[in-house]
């Protein structure tokens, strides 16, 4: 019996204050460096230990960053996205998309708590 994997997608606004060494995370993606097939979005690839993002705790590796200080990250070259973050100022507002994996029961059986119910 195979289990079915669903994804619960949520969005969140995260406000970070730039620390002494910056925001404290790495990104991948962009129109010239697609991280996800057919998706040129910007994704968090690493949260640096003891950095601003890690200390805040909400941003996670694998999150998709939709906007920075209200500026959409769609259709940006990787370099341009990096520059946008680096020039974002002291207080940085991130609109992010979390994608949580939800493991459900066997196919044909909808278990309790199944979000598709």
């Amino acid at each position: 019996m195979n289990g079915r994997v669903d994804y619960l997608v949520t969005e969140e606004e995260i406000n970070l204050t730039r620390g002494p060494s910056g925001l404290g995370f790495n990104i991948v993606g962009g129109t010239d460096q697609q991280y996800v097939s057919n998706d040129s979005g910007i994704y968090v690839s690493r949260i640096k230990e003891n950095g601003a993002a890690a200390l805040d705790g909400r941003l996670q590796e694998g999150d998709k960053i939709l906007s920075v200080n209200g500026q959409d990250l769609k259709n940006l070259l990787h370099q341009d996205a990096v520059d946008l973050f680096r020039n974002a100022g002291y207080a940085v507002s991130l609109r992010v998309q979390h994608r949580l994996q939800v493991q459900n029961g066997p196919i044909g059986h909808r278990g309790e708590g199944d979000p598709s119910g």
Partner: nanobody, 127 residues
Framework: EVQLVESGGGLVQAGASLRLSCAAS????????MAWFRQAPGKEREFVAE????????WYSDSVKGRFTISRDNAKNTVYLQMNNLKPEDTAVYYC?????????????????????WGQGTQVTVS
Amino acid sequence: EVQLVESGGGLVQAGASLRLSCAASGGTFSSYAMAWFRQAPGKEREFVAEDSWSNHRVWYSDSVKGRFTISRDNAKNTVYLQMNNLKPEDTAVYYCAAYCDYSGSTVDPPNQSEYDYWGQGTQVTVS
């Protein structure tokens, strides 16, 4: 373990050009972000320029933007720093540095704590 060896430094007049080279060995060169830092007498080491081939990015400090150009030759495992219109304040020991950037681009300004490997440095003096 990556070894870095810088060359190309020297004594030049203000307004002249120099090209520094940094030869790397012991790693998969194209997977490394390569950078140049410099340290002037009595000052802290500061970032100059960075090139990440795998992540399609370059980055310069404001003090060298428009005058210095970083480039790399992955076939030769070498990174270069072309320095034009040199000024006396460019006098420093120039260091090549590297780190493996498989985990994407840092959104923070380059910080020497990110770099795992360093060369011994080459002296540039502008009179």
